[in-house]
């Protein structure tokens, strides 16, 4: 009689998560009479995995009804695979007995389970950085198997190469991780520009996992300032006027100070949105020149978005004006917040006339 | 460890109908094979029939086709025998065994069910 | 259907002696390479016992006094040396088709 043979005829069997794999093993004989069994792993570790004779495996079926007259085949189908079933498995035959007695073994199956990676998550710094900085993006994918895995990055489509990526773990494991940081350069540009952490798969079929991070949540463009003073008017009135260009994001305010002392102070809100994403916005004082004996040095304190404030003075020569009596008013409060005066929108140099 | 344990010992009219329960143990019931087998008093084995429990498929001796029905249950491991239109000479120990090795034979049996059959 | 024929009825061997017993098919029960014959011992008020399957395989636990041999349609078991506790009846059984059983063959010490 020739020896029995248990056939494992696939070394590896590589299958998606979620599908059944079916695990196919043979024998070559029905001498000796005795169950089969399969086990996950080798040695006195192993699980098992099913027992034709025994037990109650609800995601193992026999592939053959094992009733059938003289049946030799002991495949067996796991349904809804997960990561976590990845491994090798061996078809072990045991000899009828009290207890059964294992015989031998087949050469063991490998199962690769394909699982796909999450959504990339893209997160940027915690704190806004400004215009002409660098800042660091970082893109995380977890649960994907097997380990190889392409990341690139983008910017406004433009593949970005100050990029550090990792897999983990390094060695074996069910499924794996992968975390990537790009080092991003911000210019007064990038308002609507938007970073792209792309991930590519043997799983996704060539259709590649994106996540994305708006600029938008990371940039701060510093507004440029400029006070200028209007013609002076019949009742001996000036417009100065302070323009504030080019700055995001919106949170700003404003303080007029006249020879030191504040005036008044505006908080910018529900601004126009220039072609760029940034804003601008016009703010003026009226000054009475007659009331006042001395020159005025009027000065425009802009506060962005948390940032030290940023000053621009302009000083009002009232020597030239004669006085009006009956006048105690040294400047009006009027007119001074006009949020529809900002027609500018992105016409880059109408409004950069520095006066120093 | 294999057990088949039988219900016991039944007296029975001619005409009248005898159900044997056979309650499997320590193996999966729905994978292996129950067979029949009946022994008349100092007489031989003769087989009666065969049930997959996963299934219900049945095979007969043709001698008793018509008068018996082999039955499982599955949620309790059972298989059941019924003889109908008891003869004297249906007289007999009842035996279940099961085929461990899908060979039909009987590696395991139980202990016997013996029926009388007498007016 | 197949018959089995058992020869003979009833045989009586000295302790430590050979015992030999034959099964004739009416026809081949042999398949595919294999052997569907099947030797049962069966000792007073006890349900039978697998000896043999296939032929010639033992069961496990079978002392390895008990052996089969034979092919196609002829078929022995033997007891090379026969025990006091041997004493039974001895059938054997196909399953080449639905199975049936030999009509047995009584073995005591002579």
């Known amino acids: 009689e020739e020896e029995l043979q248990v056939i494992q005829p696939e070394k590896s069997v590589s299958v998606a998560a979620g599908d059944s794999a079916t695990l196919n093993c043979t024998v070559s004989s029905l001498i000796p009479v005795g169950p089969i069994q399969w086990f996950r792993g080798a040695g006195p570790g192993r699980e098992l995995i099913y027992n034709l004779k025994e037990g109650h495996f609800p995601r193992v079926t026999a592939v053959s009804d094992p009733t059938k007259r003289n049946n030799m085949d002991f495949s067996i189908r796991i349904s809804n695979i997960t990561p976590a079933d990845a491994g090798t498995y061996y078809c072990v035959k045991f000899r009828k007995g009290s207890p059964d007695v294992e015989l031998k073994s087949g050469a063991g199956t490998e199962l690769s389970v394909r699982a796909k990676p999450s959504a990339p998550v893209v997160s940027g710094p915690a704190v806004r950085a400004t215009a002409e900085h660098t800042v660091s993006f970082t893109c995380e994918s977890h649960g994907f198997s097997p380990r190889d895995i392409t990341l690139k990055w983008f910017k406004n489509g433009n593949e970005l190469s100050d990029v550090q990526t990792n897999v983990d773990p390094a060695g074996k494991s069910v499924s794996y991780s992968i975390r990537s940081t790009a080092r991003v350069l911000l210019t007064r540009r990038d308002v609507h520009s938007q970073v792209i952490c792309e991930v590519a798969h043997v799983t996704l079929q060539g259709d590649p996992l994106r996540g994305t991070a708006n600029l938008s949540e990371a940039i701060r463009v510093p507004p440029f300032l400029e006070v200028t003073q209007q013609s002076m008017r019949a009742d001996n009135q000036v417009n100065v006027t302070c323009q504030v260009t080019k700055f995001y994001p919106q949170r700003l305010q404003l303080t007029w100070l006249e020879n030191g002392n504040v005036s008044r102070t505006e908080m910018a809100s529900a601004l126009p949105e220039n072609k760029d994403g940034t804003y601008n916005w016009t703010s003026w004082l009226l000054v009475n020149v007659s009331a006042h004996r001395d020159d005025v040095k009027l000065t425009c304190q802009v506060e962005h978005d948390g940032q030290p404030a940023v000053n621009k003075s302009f000083s009002v020569k009232v020597s030239a004006h004669p006085k009006e009596q009956g006048s105690n008013t040294a400047a009006e409060n009027t007119g001074t917040n006009e949020r529809g005066s900002s027609d500018y929108k992105d016409d880059d140099d109408k409004h950069h006339h520095h006066h120093h | 460890q294999v057990q088949l344990v039988q219900s016991g010992a039944e007296v029975k009219k001619p005409g009248a109908s005898v159900k044997v329960s056979c309650k499997a143990s320590g193996y999966t019931f729905t994978n292996y094979w129950i067979n029949w087998v009946r022994q008349a008093p100092g007489q031989g084995l003769e087989w009666i029939a065969m049930i997959d429990p996963s299934d219900s498929e049945t095979h007969y001796n043709q001698i008793f086709k018509d008068r018996a029905t082999l039955t499982t249950d599955t949620s309790t491991s059972t298989a059941y025998m019924e003889l109908r239109s008891l003869r004297s000479d249906d007289t007999a120990v009842y035996y279940c065994?099961?085929?461990?090795?899908?060979?039909?034979?009987?590696?395991?049996w139980g202990r016997g069910t013996l029926v009388t059959v007498s007016s | 259907d197949i018959v089995l024929t058992q020869s003979p009825d009833s045989l009586a061997v000295s302790l430590g002696e050979r015992a030999t017993i034959n099964c004739r098919a009416s026809k081949s029960v042999s398949s595919s390479g294999y052997n569907y014959i099947f030797w049962y011992q069966q000792k007073p008020g006890q349900p039978p016992k697998l000896l043999i399957y296939l032929a010639s395989n033992l069961d496990p636990g079978v002392p390895d006094r008990f052996s089969g041999s034979g092919s196609g349609t002829d078929f022995t078991l033997t007891i090379s040396s026969l025990q006091a506790e041997d004493v039974a009846v001895y059938y054997c059984?196909?399953?080449?088709?639905?199975?049936?059983f030999g009509q047995g063959t009584k073995l005591e010490i002579k």
């Open positions: 059984q196909h399953s080449r088709e639905l199975p049936t």
């Open positions: 065994a099961m085929d461990y090795g899908s060979l039909y034979a009987m590696d395991y």
